[in-house]
C-alpha cells in the first residue's frame, strides 16, 4: 500500500471528511477526471487539481498535527505527478506563485503573450508537424 | 496572421508592456516552456499559464476599452489550447474556480484525495498498462 493512503485517511479525520454526506452534490475532481482519457487532456486537468492541493496544504503548513501527513502526500505527488523530477516540480511551483496584480508580472505576461499563444497548440511546436497536418486536411 | 496578434499588441499598449526593459530579469513563461518538450509535460505547465491569463483577464472583464482584445485572445486560447472543445474548457474553468478556503470544497477534496492520487501517474489508469510495465522492469 502506498504511504499516502494512511496519511490521507488521517487527513479525512482531521477535516471530518470521512462521512458519506461529503459526496452529496457531486464530486470536485473525480467526475472531471472521468471525462478525459487522453493523456494530455488529463494533464491539463490534473495540473489544476495538484495546484489546488498544494494551495490547500500551504494553508495548513503550520499545523503540527497534520504536518507529517501533508509532507508524505506532497512527496508522493512529487513521485507520481512530477516523476520525482525536481526541475519539473520547481517550474510548476514557480508558475503557481505568480501574482496577477504584481506590476512586473503583469507586464511580462502581456509581453510574452504572443509567443505563449503561438506555442499553445501541439502542432505549433515544429514546422514539420504543422506541415504534415496540413497534408491530411485535403 | 492570427487575430490574437493584433489584440495582444493592443494589450501591450494598455499595460505598457512593449518596452524592451520588460524582458529584464528573465521571462515568466517562455523559459519554463523551453525546458519541456514532452507533450504531457508541456500541458502541465501550459495549464497553469492559461489559468494565469484567465485570472488576469477576469480582473479586466468590465473594462470596455480592452474588452474586445480580451475576448479575442480568450477565444483564440479556446481554439488552440482546448481544441474548441466547450466541455474541456468548462471542466478546466470549474477546477480553477474552486476555493481552497471553502469548507465544503476542502472536505470534498480530502475525501477524493486517495482516488485522485491513484490516478496521477500515467501508468495508473489501467491495470493492463501497469502489468506490462512491470514486465519491463525485471
Amino acid at each position: 500500500q502506498d504511504p499516502y493512503v494512511k496519511e490521507a485517511e488521517n487527513l479525512k479525520k482531521y477535516f471530518n471528511a470521512g462521512h458519506s454526506d461529503v459526496a452529496d452534490n457531486g464530486t470536485l475532481f473525480l467526475g472531471i477526471l472521468k471525462n478525459w482519457k487522453e493523456e494530455s487532456d488529463r494533464k491539463i486537468m490534473q495540473s489544476q487539481i495538484v495546484s489546488f492541493y498544494f494551495k490547500l496544504f500551504k494553508n495548513f503548513k503550520d499545523d503540527q498535527s497534520i504536518q507529517k501527513s501533508v509532507e508524505t502526500i506532497k512527496e508522493d505527488m512529487n513521485v507520481k505527478f512530477f516523476n520525482s523530477n525536481k526541475k519539473k516540480r520547481d517550474d510548476f511551483e514557480k508558475l503557481t506563485n505568480y501574482s496577477v496584480t504584481d506590476l512586473n508580472v503583469q507586464r511580462k505576461a502581456i509581453h510574452e503573450l504572443i509567443q505563449v499563444m503561438a506555442e499553445l497548440s501541439p502542432a505549433a511546436k515544429t514546422g514539420k508537424r504543422k506541415r504534415s497536418q496540413m497534408l491530411f486536411r485535403g | 496572421q492570427d487575430p490574437y496578434v493584433k489584440e495582444a499588441e493592443n494589450l501591450k499598449k494598455y499595460f505598457n508592456a512593449g518596452h524592451s526593459d520588460v524582458a529584464d530579469n528573465g521571462t515568466l513563461f517562455l523559459g519554463i516552456l523551453k525546458n519541456w518538450k514532452e507533450e504531457s509535460d508541456r500541458k502541465i505547465m501550459q495549464s497553469q499559464i492559461v489559468s494565469f491569463y484567465f485570472k488576469l483577464f477576469k480582473n479586466f472583464k468590465d473594462d470596455q476599452s480592452i474588452q474586445k482584445s480580451v475576448e479575442t485572445i480568450k477565444e483564440d486560447m479556446n481554439v488552440k489550447f482546448f481544441n474548441s472543445n466547450k466541455k474541456k474548457r468548462d471542466d478546466f474553468e470549474k477546477l480553477t474556480n474552486y476555493s481552497v478556503t471553502d469548507l465544503n470544497v476542502q472536505r470534498k477534496a480530502i475525501h477524493e484525495l486517495i482516488q485522485v492520487m491513484a490516478e496521477l501517474s500515467p501508468a495508473a489508469k489501467t491495470g493492463k498498462r501497469k502489468r506490462s510495465q512491470m514486465l519491463f522492469r525485471g
Partner: nanobody, 116 residues
Framework: QVQLQESGGGLVQPGGSLRLSCAAS????????MSWVRQPPGKGIEWVSS????????TYADSVKGRFTIARDNANNILYLQMNSLKPEDTAVYYC?????????RGQGTQVTVSS
Amino acid sequence: QVQLQESGGGLVQPGGSLRLSCAASGFTVSNYAMSWVRQPPGKGIEWVSSINNRNDHITYADSVKGRFTIARDNANNILYLQMNSLKPEDTAVYYCASRVDDRVSRGQGTQVTVSS
C-alpha cells in the same frame, strides 16, 4: 492621431475629493467606449471604471462603487472621473484608455496621493 492627456491629480486628505480630466484629441469621445484605470505604487494596472459609446452602460470596480463617478463632456471632448470619499488605498497614477478604430490607447497618467 489619437492622444489622451490626463490632469487633475494631486495630494488630498482621506475623505477628500478630486476630479480628474482626460482631454482627447484625434477622435470624438462620444463615439467610443472609454475607461479609467490606475496603477498603485509597486502594483499592476487595476481597472476602475468604464463608459460605453452610448452612455447607457457604465461600470465600476467594486472598490470604488458609490464613491467614483465617470462622465464625459462631449462638447469639449473630455472624459471625467469624479472621486469622492478618497481613501489612502486610492493612491495611484490614474490613466484614461480607449479603443479607437481597433487600436487601444492610454494616456501618460496623473498622480493621485491620498494622505493625511
